[in-house]
């Protein structure tokens, strides 16, 4: 099943996806879509890149904030709502028949925890909890490369995701805040 990522309502969600252009600068088109990767292309495209730039974005909340010219095509969704929950498809569109790399990632949007900071806890919660617990590493959620190698010399790196879960309870306990 797809790897899960968790974000709080109102925060930014980060859904990782990357490949290694070979040679450097030899970019391939990428699409992000809402819904599991279909047979072809992306369904319900939220963002699409060509060989140079992002050229199709359905909302100003969707961004590639990494260095996409180096193959970091991780999706950032700003100011997430509960409606943003669901499976997303990152499709790296390698030239050639059926050479695309398909990666399904699941975004779980949760309501903010009700937190009452202790009097001594003055810092902003987002800086108080910068760490995310990594519980495991996973290979491609789904990869389909039955076709011949592409004409251009491309090496797609092994896509790798980590199941990351906010450990709010432990962080709050460490900081002296109380949870209701």
């Amino acid at each position: 099943s797809e790897v899960e990522y968790i974000a709080e309502v109102g925060q930014n969600a980060y859904l990782p996806c990357s490949y290694t252009p070979a040679p450097p600068g030899n970019l391939v088109p990428v699409c992000w879509g809402k819904g599991a990767c279909p047979v072809f292309d992306c369904s319900n495209v939220v963002l699409r890149t060509d060989n140079r730039d992002v050229n199709d974005r359905t909302s100003g909340r969707y961004w590639l904030k990494g260095d996409f010219h180096k193959g970091d095509v991780s999706l950032t969704i700003e100011n997430v709502t509960l409606a943003d929950s669901g499976v997303y498809c990152c499709r790296i569109q390698i030239p050639g028949i059926m050479n695309d790399e398909k990666h399904n990632v699941k975004l779980v949007v949760i309501k903010p925890a009700k937190v009452t900071p202790a009097p001594t806890l003055q810092r902003d919660l987002t800086s108080a909890f910068p760490r995310m617990l990594t519980t495991g590493e996973h290979g491609p959620a789904e990869t389909q490369t039955p076709g011949s190698l592409p004409d251009v010399n491309l090496t797609v790196s092994n896509f790798f995701c980590e199941l990351q879960i906010f450990t709010l309870t432990n962080e709050l306990r460490d900081s002296g805040a109380t949870i209701r």
Epitope: G35, A36, C37, P38, V39, F40, D41, S43, N44, V87, P95, I97, M98, N104, Q144
Partner: antibody, heavy 116, light 107 residues
């Protein structure tokens, strides 16, 4: 209004060839994948082929691979299906449809009959 | 390939009643599933995609549900124009495949 109109169907002998055409209107043709789906008389639907926008990739169901060729012409807003080495089992109504994964809308279809 | 099995093959329902059509995939297709309606002598018409999203212009009485391998198309209150053949189609796995269809007839 989005519209797809197929033509080119007819009666052909086994081993013969036929070229189907689909004229599209009412949308930006070059922005969409296009597909062909067929339906044998009294039977269900079978996806046949599709072509990526721009024509850089073409896909076929195994039963027609090497015999059928899908192509597109953005200038004419048209998609074609060249069918060679036709067999009796290729007899069907052939529909042109917009889309790569799900299909909307569909043309009215054109009947291809392969018989001696 | 992914085999799509629809049941029942024929469904007899009275106008105004609810109709429930089933579609089962031989392997998971996530929510990558569409439903079509085909009337005699006409081309199919897209009703539902992504398992539960109604296509443009489709009345609210049509609804889709399910994910993975089990899917349902529900028509809440049958109108005379709804009697037709209904097909499910998966687009998660290669190649794209359709179910054999369910014929919805007037009881």
């Amino acid at each position: 209004e989005v519209q797809l109109v197929e033509s080119g169907g007819g009666l052909v002998q086994p081993g013969g060839s036929l070229r189907l055409s689909c004229a599209a209107s009412g949308f930006t043709f070059s922005s969409y994948w296009m597909s062909w789906v067929r339906q044998a008389p009294g039977k269900g639907l079978e996806w046949v082929a599709n072509i990526k926008r721009g024509g850089s990739e073409r896909y076929y169901v195994d039963s027609v691979k090497g015999r059928f060729t899908i192509s597109g012409d953005n200038a004419k807003n048209s998609v074609y299906l060249q069918m060679n080495s036709l067999r009796a089992e290729d007899t069907a109504v052939y529909y042109c449809a917009r889309g790569s994964n799900w299909f909307d809308p569909w043309g009215q279809g054109t009947l291809v009959t392969v018989s001696s | 390939e992914t085999v799509m099995t629809q049941s029942p093959a024929i469904l007899s329902v009275s106008p105004g009643e609810r109709a429930t059509l089933s579609c089962r995939a031989s392997q998971s297709v996530y929510s990558n599933l569409a439903w079509y309606q085909q009337k005699l002598g006409q081309a199919p018409r897209l009703l539902i995609y992504d398992a539960s999203t109604r296509a443009t212009g489709i009345p609210a009485r049509f609804s889709g549900s399910g994910s993975g391998t089990e899917f349902t198309l529900t028509i809440s209150s049958l109108q005379s124009e709804d009697f037709a053949v209904y097909y499910c189609q998966q687009y998660n796995n290669w190649p794209i495949t359709f179910g054999q269809g369910t014929r919805l007839e007037i009881k």
